[in-house]
């Protein structure tokens, strides 16, 4: 990681638990204010590798429900609605940070985890064609 | 949130602090061993709606680095590797947490932070508003 | 229980025409792709066509592609392969196949066959 | 198209023994890979999915495992109802195609 220079505003914390153990306020602060994910909703449903919203909801973790993607088909949508046998579906993964309770069904203590999610679909050629 | 139970073995934390600032371990625990999300890097290139990354730093941030996919085109790519018009390539995006310090500079100080990165791109039938 | 049922092999001569029928039952036809396979004597298994739900896509590989055609009555819940131009390396059993899909990747179900000698 | 190579193209051994039949594919496959089982005179019957996913009904002695060209079938305990045939099939690239076969007998 990148070394901060110590704020002297900044709370205390001895050496040997740093960076180990932090604490994080837990008020999200959204950045989003500008755009609206609501407007890429419709995606799903009109791509040409459309795909399914599925609810994974974890108790233990922070956030406790995330959406993951599943293409509902093998291969593309052409634009009669059938599929392309020459083109596939795949998902579009991505790792992102979550917070797991820590020891179990504590309140307020985390590790920090990270985990794949699959976030759309997208569709690609199977074959890359090798050039000599 | 869901009311969890204390556990006896947990950390304690005045309820006037919670759960507004909560203990995080930052040792990452990836639960990632099983797939390997090297294997999709090349769909960015074989996309019929490609995408190129782009880096966004920022060290008062965890995680600091973060990619963002930018559309190559506005339409898709055709099997002839022409693009077609028709149809547009969208950027697929996800609300992700991120760490904030804060305090700016604070090295075991942050809050919670929703951000909003585009993953990916996926080719779309655009909407057509029908005039009466 | 799902059942699929080839008929219409034989024997036929190179050059010659021959017409598959597979009758499906069981479950509800118009919902799954459908495959045609076939294994000659003694060998593997080798995709010969495929065709989608409602018949809107299909796929042939080179070795068959323009002498055989797969389609579907859905009405009938059957699936063809008209086969023309048969050649001796043709001579195969047939097998058609069931998708868990609407679109014909991997097969669930098959037939029990049926035997296409092309001989003189 | 893609080439699938399986080996060993047969194979004896013996009631409870571990049973491993491998299949490489000419080029990645991102787990779109099936394998079936064929008796003589029967039609194949489809055991695995995706590389790893046990179709309905199918024993848990059967498994499957790998990513990218390399796959691997296990039986993890042979019973003598197991002595068939057995083939792979990609299906990331048409035309979808099938490994040469391994044949299972029993010692």
């Known amino acids: 990681g990148i070394a901060i220079p110590r704020n002297s505003g900044c709370p205390n914390s001895e050496d040997k638990n740093f960076p180990r153990t932090v604490m994080v306020n837990l008020n999200i602060h959204n950045r989003n204010t500008s755009t609206n994910p609501k407007r890429s909703s419709d995606y799903y449903n009109r791509s040409t590798s459309p795909w399914n919203l599925h609810r994974n909801e974890d108790p233990e973790r922070y956030p406790s429900v995330i959406w993951e993607a599943k293409c509902r088909h093998l291969g593309c949508v052409k634009a009669d609605g059938n599929v392309d046998y020459h083109m596939n579906s795949v998902p579009i993964q991505q790792e992102i940070l979550v917070l797991r309770r820590e020891p179990r069904h504590c309140p307020n203590s985390f590790r920090l985890e990270k985990i794949l999610v699959s976030v759309g679909c997208t569709c690609v050629t199977p074959i890359v064609h090798h050039v000599a | 949130g869901i009311a969890i139970p204390r556990n006896s073995g947990c950390p304690n934390s005045e309820d006037k602090n919670f759960p507004r600032t909560v203990m995080v371990n930052l040792n990452i625990h990836n639960r990632n061993t099983s797939t390997n999300p090297k294997r999709s890097s090349d769909y960015y290139n074989r996309s019929t709606s490609p995408w190129n990354l782009h880096r966004n730093e920022d060290p008062e941030r965890y995680p600091s680095v973060i990619w963002e996919a930018k559309c190559r085109h506005l339409g898709c790519v055709k099997a002839d590797g022409n693009v077609d018009y028709h149809m547009n390539s969208v950027p697929i995006q996800q609300e992700i947490l991120v760490l904030r310090r804060e305090p700016r500079h604070c090295p075991n100080s942050f809050r919670l932070e929703k951000i909003l990165v585009s993953v990916g791109c996926t080719c779309v039938t655009p909407i057509v508003h029908h005039v009466a | 229980e799902v059942q699929l049922v080839e008929s219409g092999g034989g024997l036929v001569q190179p050059g010659g025409s021959l017409r598959l029928s597979c009758a499906a039952s069981g479950f509800t036809f118009s919902t799954y792709g459908m495959s045609w396979v076939r294994q000659a004597p003694g060998k593997g298994l080798e995709l010969v066509s495929i065709?989608?739900?409602?018949?809107?896509?299909?796929f042939y590989p080179d070795s068959v592609k323009g002498r055989f055609t797969i389609s579907r009555d859905n009405s009938k819940n059957t699936l063809y392969l008209q086969m023309n131009s048969l050649r001796a390396e043709d001579t195969a059993v047939y097998y058609c196949?069931?998708?868990?899909?609407?679109?014909?990747?991997?097969?669930?179900?098959w037939g029990q066959g049926t035997l296409v000698t092309v001989s003189s | 198209d893609i080439q699938m190579t399986q080996s060993p193209s047969s194979l004896s051994a013996s009631v409870g023994d571990r049973v491993t039949i491998t299949c490489q594919a000419s080029e990645d496959i991102y787990d779109r890979l099936a394998w079936y089982q064929q008796k003589p005179g029967k039609a194949p019957k489809l055991l695995i999915s995706?590389?790893?996913s046990l179709e309905t009904g199918v024993p848990s002695r059967f498994s499957g495992s790998g990513s990218g060209k390399d796959y691997t079938f296990t039986i993890s305990s042979l019973q003598p109802e197991d002595i068939a045939t057995y083939y792979c099939q990609q299906y990331w690239s048409v035309p979808w195609t099938f490994g040469g076969g391994t044949k299972v007998e029993i010692k």
């Open positions: 065709i989608n739900h409602n018949g809107g896509s299909t």
């Open positions: 196949a069931r998708d868990p899909r609407h679109d014909g990747y991997f097969f669930d179900y």
């Open positions: 995706g590389a790893t």
